[in-house]
Every structure is written in C-alpha cells, then in structure tokens.
C-alpha cells in the first residue's frame, strides 16, 4: 500500500485525543463504578467493533500495512455516529443543551472524513438495528454507549499516537 | 455471584401502602442503577422505576406515575418501593434488578435479578 493512502497521522492524533476528552465529559462514570468494564463474552453478543489483536492495530502492523486497522476504526466511529443518531440519544430525556453530545458527534465525523480517502468507496458496514427504546431505557443506553465508546477512542488514540511517532513521514528540507 | 433479595412483599387492600425492599448479598457489588419490574399472572414482566445512582434520576411507568416511589442508599446498594394507593391491577410478582455497569446494550439491560416478592391487592 503506497504511502500517500496514510492519514495524517498527527491530525487523527490530535482529533481522537480530542474525542477521548469529549467522549468522558460526556459521561464521567460515577466514582464508584467500575470503569470501562467490558465482559469477555460480550464481542459474540453484540456486533460492535471492537480493535483486536487480528485487526494489525500493533506496532508492527501498522508498519507494514496501516490500512486493515484504519479500516477497523473507520467502522467503529460509523457504528458509533449512528448510534449518536439514534432515538437513543434524541430522545426524550432530553440531554441538557450545554452537553458535549453535539461536539462528540462533530468530531466523531471529522476523523472519519479525514480517515476517509477521497478515491475511496464508501464501505458497507453492518449497522445495529435499535427497536425503538422507551424512556426508562435510555439513561441506561446511553451509559453503556457512551463507555463503549470512550473504551474505542482510548485504544484508537494509542494508534494515532503511535502511527504520529513512528509513521509521519519526515519533512524533506528544500534546497 | 450476587444475589439481590427482596422483602415487604403481602397481602394489603385496595387504597393501602405497601414498602419494598432489595439489597445485594455482596456488600462490595456497586450498581449503577437499579430497579423495580414486577409480572402479573399471564403477563409479561414490565418496568415499574428506576434509580440511577450517579445524579439520582428517577424514571416510572406511567400506571405508577404520583403512587409509587423509588429510592436508595448507593453505598449500601438497597433500594425501595414505596408503594401507594394500591389497585388490584398492581397485584403481581415484584422484581428488583441492578446493572453493574456492564457496556453491552443488545443484552437485558438489567443482569442482575432477585427472585421476587408477592403483592395481592384485594379489592
């Protein structure tokens, strides 16, 4: 894969570590709580994307071909983004009009545009079907939502951190 | 494993009150939320309220919207339900449920259960 197919990798950086922050003033989980629990068992009960270890999301992996993990994160900020389009999140109760949900959603689209190659076909993506949730339902969704998310953000700003350090090609000083 | 254990559950007449009661078995569980469901005879299990610890929002089924209220003690994961003028139509089994805080949405929403306690509102 050519060269000129890689992000700019300091840009995703900055954008995801900025999705992080957004994604936690979103939902800071009480103190109590057990952050980002995730069960093991969870991945085969729902079709959300997850990174994995097969996704070439490690070091060496990003060297010798950046696009199957950029791929992978491609997906999960599109899973998300419709998941933040849902009733789930527009739904009554309303969230307060000061919420970071506007600007998580924002940026959610903007790192998925500049991870979006402009020759690049847009990719059919199996998206999660929401029976229409009830009221009491969706405190609860989002909770599980939002903490699913910061959980994807946080590793997929471990990629960009590195894919910044180590795959930013260097400037070349002009004569 | 924890267990969630109800109580308060009986036998009480139209118009009067009835308090519930749940707490987990496992004093070290924290919840991010919990509830009540309960299940007539023939009928499927409904929402009745919630609480969700981090803000205290409340939330209720319509049909117990003014006559029940839900509440809690979050360090000691009990929670409530007081229960007001009763109908016959709230005789039903009373669940108490609590979500740990799990990020799986497709599943239950709630993974934790009690066994139940028994309301009969005679007319």
């Known amino acids: 894969v050519p060269r000129s197919s890689s992000p700019d990798w300091a840009q995703c950086q900055q954008l995801s570590r900025n999705l992080c922050m957004l994604a936690w003033n979103a939902h800071a989980p009480a103190g109590h709580m057990n952050l980002l629990r995730e069960e093991e068992d969870e991945e085969t009960k729902n079709n959300v994307p997850r990174i994995q270890c097969e996704d070439g999301c490690d070091p060496q992996g990003l060297k010798d071909n950046s696009q199957f993990c950029l791929q992978r994160i491609r997906q999960g900020l599109a899973f998300y983004k419709h998941l933040l389009d849902s009733d789930i999140f527009k739904g009554e109760p309303a969230l307060l009009p000061d919420s970071p949900m506007e600007q998580l959603h924002t940026s959610l689209l903007g790192l998925s545009q500049l991870l979006q190659p402009e020759d690049h076909p847009r990719e059919t993506q199996q998206m999660p079907s929401l029976s229409s949730s009830q009221q009491w339902q969706r405190p609860l969704l989002r909770s599980k939502i939002l903490r699913s998310l910061q959980a994807f953000l946080a590793i997929a700003a471990r990629v960009f951190a590195h894919g910044a350090a180590t795959l930013t090609e260097p400037l070349v000083p002009t004569a | 494993e924890v267990q969630l254990v109800e109580s308060g559950g009986g036998l009480v007449q139209a118009g009067g009150s009835l308090r519930l009661s749940c707490a987990a078995s496992?004093?070290?569980?924290?919840?991010?939320?919990m509830a009540w469901f309960r299940q007539a005879p023939g009928k499927e299990r409904e929402f009745v309220a919630q609480?969700?610890?981090?803000?205290?929002?409340?939330y209720y089924a319509d049909s117990v919207k003014g006559r029940f209220t839900i509440s809690g003690d979050n360090a000691k994961n009990t929670v409530y339900l007081q229960m007001n003028r009763l109908k016959p139509e709230d005789t039903a089994v009373y669940y108490c449920?609590?979500?740990?805080?799990?990020?799986?949405?497709?599943?239950?929403?709630?993974?934790?259960w009690g066994q139940g306690t028994q309301v009969t509102v005679s007319s």
């Open positions: 449920a609590a979500d740990s805080g799990r990020t799986d949405w497709t599943a239950d929403l709630y993974d934790y």
């Open positions: 496992d004093r070290t569980f924290s919840s991010y939320a």
């Open positions: 609480i969700i610890w981090s803000g205290g929002s409340t």
